[in-house]
């Protein structure tokens, strides 16, 4: 940011005009007393942004801090801010006016404070006095800020002489408070209860000897008061606890319970609130979606997770093909249900090193005396493809055939390709795809079988080659969602007496 004039302090003539400019690489704005005075914004051809603040008919009340800042500092690296302090010496203005809260200075510890009496003219001599004394106090004065130092609990005034008249500031009152901060914590035995169950809340305050507890709760608003019990936790000094106990809760007891604690010496306070829900009966609710078809990869571990809400705590069972599952001693299956919050649960079924036999219909059932929910899905075991056989034969018809057999789950795709130039292919030349209907030189026949017991597909594909006039490398590639496998065979012409 570039500010003109650069300051950092300017002394300007009363009743005159003066312009402050600020330029930057992003939009800029002038601020005065946390407000944006009317100003002109502009953007130059070189991309520089400027803001022009024209101060007209200046008076002593224009004395003070002016800040230039980026209009929107969120997108910028540094929250840069330029400060300018302007004095407008004005004999008609004595001390600059203060907000009421600036006249009362509260302290909670012995620390340096500032009595903010400021004048419009930096040449004026300003002195600080106790309200009822004439002796000037030896405290340093900054014309831009006021008197800074460590002060007693007293009343103070500032004095200056403008021309031939003595001017007094308003009185400033300094109060030192002895405070022990209050920190309240509220918790409930349960934040969800069924009607007829008890609600019990505890409010604890640390570090104070004398406090007053006040509870607000739904019953109180209808005039039905509950008497809290207050006790001291003997094993912990200055721990005071208030217990609010509501037996046999009703639906109308749902709502916000607030504990307000007041420290009687200095009247400091703190409050905390907690929400209680009273339900007519228990519930179990699924959270989120679990697809009806799930996948696991053969020999890999797979965790299936269900998230639900329940109150009271439910029993959780897992089934496979309607048979109850339990943790297996061999460590092949692990079941766990954990409470992640008061009413939220995560149930997990972990299959370790998945086997084909673990495919099937799985169900999780969560239930208690009031409600139940169940979730089912089919688990498919995906098996990487493998080429089991690739063989070449010479039927009597004169054509040559290559048969490729492989298995996998889900169903594999088969891709046939050939290389005619054995020296350069496939490293330098890409193999040619075979089996397209446009290819008259080759014909393709593919059969797919699903083996129920192994729960996988078998693909058998036969490639018929019409005439092979030189050695040919034929490659069979099987592919599915979890892998691919390739084998190749060299097919030689009938006329050649040998085969590689």
């Amino acid at each position: 940011l570039v500010v003109t004039p650069p300051g950092p302090e300017l002394v300007l003539n009363v009743s005159s005009t003066f312009v402050l400019t600020c330029s930057g690489s992003a939009p800029v704005v002038w601020e005065r007393m946390s407000q944006e005075p009317p100003q002109e914004m502009a953007k130059a051809q070189d991309g520089t942004f400027s803001s022009v603040l024209t101060l007209t008919n200046l008076t002593g009340l224009d004395t003070g801090e002016y800040f230039c800042t980026h209009n929107d500092s969120r997108g910028l690296e540094t929250d840069e801010r330029k400060r300018l302090y302007i004095f407008v010496p004005d004999p008609t203005v004595g001390f600059l006016p203060n907000d009421a809260e600036e006249l009362f200075i509260f302290l909670t510890e012995i620390t340096e404070i500032t009595i903010p009496c400021r004048v419009t003219d930096p040449q004026l001599v300003v002195t600080l006095h106790e309200k009822k004394g004439d002796v000037a106090l030896p405290v340093p004065y900054d014309h831009q800020r006021g008197f800074s130092g460590i002060f007693e609990d007293r009343s103070y005034i500032c004095k200056t002489t403008i021309g031939d008249r003595e001017v007094d500031s308003d009185a400033y009152y300094v109060y030192r408070l002895q405070v022990s901060s209050i920190n309240v914590s509220v918790n409930a035995v349960q934040t969800v209860v069924r009607q007829g169950e008890n609600i019990t809340l505890m409010c604890i305050v640390i570090g104070n000897e004398v406090v007053n507890f006040e509870w607000t709760y739904p019953r109180k608003e209808s005039g039905r008061l509950v008497e809290p019990v207050t006790d001291f936790l003997l094993d912990m000094p200055y721990h005071i606890r208030s217990i609010l106990h509501i037996p046999s809760a009703e639906l109308e007891d749902s709502g916000t319970y607030t504990c307000n604690v007041t420290e009687s010496v200095n009247d400091h306070q703190d409050e905390k609130a907690i929400n209680i829900t009273v339900v007519e009966s228990g519930y179990v609710r699924l959270l989120g979606e679990v697809g009806t078809l799930q996948f696991a990869e053969l020999h890999r571990s797979r965790t299936l997770q269900v998230v639900f809400e329940a109150y009271p705590p439910p029993t959780v069972l897992w089934f496979k093909d309607n048979r109850t599952l339990g943790d297996s001693s061999a460590g092949e299956i692990a079941l766990s249900t954990r409470n992640v919050s008061e009413t939220r649960y995560v149930s997990e079924l972990t299959l370790v090193r998945v086997k084909v036999a673990e495919a099937g219909h799985y169900t999780m059932r969560a239930f208690h005396e009031d409600a139940e929910v169940q979730l089912s899905f089919q688990l498919q075991i995906n098996v990487p493809v493998r080429v089991l056989e690739l063989s070449e034969s010479h039927p009597d018809s004169g054509e040559q055939t290559v048969r490729c057999r492989g298995r996998g789950m889900p169903q594999p795709n088969i891709i046939w390709s050939a290389c005619r130039d054995l020296k350069r292919c496939p490293r330098e030349l890409p193999p040619t795809l075979l089996g397209n209907s446009s290819e008259e030189e080759s014909q393709l026949e593919t059969n797919v079988t699903y083996w129920e017991e192994e729960q996988e597909f078998e693909v058998v594909s036969t490639l018929r080659l019409q005439h092979v006039d030189r050695p040919l490398s034929v490659r069979c590639t099987l592919r599915n969602a979890v892998g691919q496998d390739t084998q190749e065979v060299i097919v030689v012409p009938h006329s050649l007496p040998f085969k590689v």
Partner: nanobody
Framework: EVQLVESGGGLVQPGGSLRLSCAAS????????MAWYRQAPGKQRELVAF???????NYVDSVRGRFTASRDNAENTLYLQMNSLKPEDTAVYYC???????????WGQGTQVTVSS
């Protein structure tokens, strides 16, 4: 204290041009902020163009591309070349100058520009 005197105002038809001059009573070398303002009847004074530290001049959107401000240090004069004038440009035009060490900015007395057919 520097004094500024404007000239060059007058009556002009829409689409016409005028060149305003602002002569300073002493060297304008120390001026680091120069600007042209205008005040139309019944309206507040508004900024038209300004230059900081003699760098590129900035213009308000309503005049950008039509007005050009410049300065001649040797002649101690500021200029505002106004082209393609419109009826809404009718106003009293003031030049303004300010230095970093000055305690107040200085205004010219103003010159009337009227754009009418």
């Amino acid at each position: 204290e520097v004094q500024l005197v404007e000239s060059g105002g007058g009556l002009v038809q829409p689409g016409g041009s005028l060149r305003l001059s602002c002569a300073a009573s002493e060297s304008i070398f120390s001026i680091n902020y120069m600007a042209w303002y205008r005040q139309a009847p019944g309206k507040q004074r508004e900024l038209v163009a300004f230059s900081i530290d003699g760098s590129s001049t900035n213009y308000v959107d309503s005049v950008r591309g039509r007005f050009t401000a410049s300065r001649d240090n040797a002649e101690n004069t500021l200029y505002l070349q106004m082209n393609s004038l419109k009826p809404e440009d009718t106003a009293v035009y003031y030049c303004y100058a300010q230095g970093n060490t000055w305690a107040a900015g200085v205004w010219g007395q103003g010159t009337q520009v009227t754009v009418s057919s």
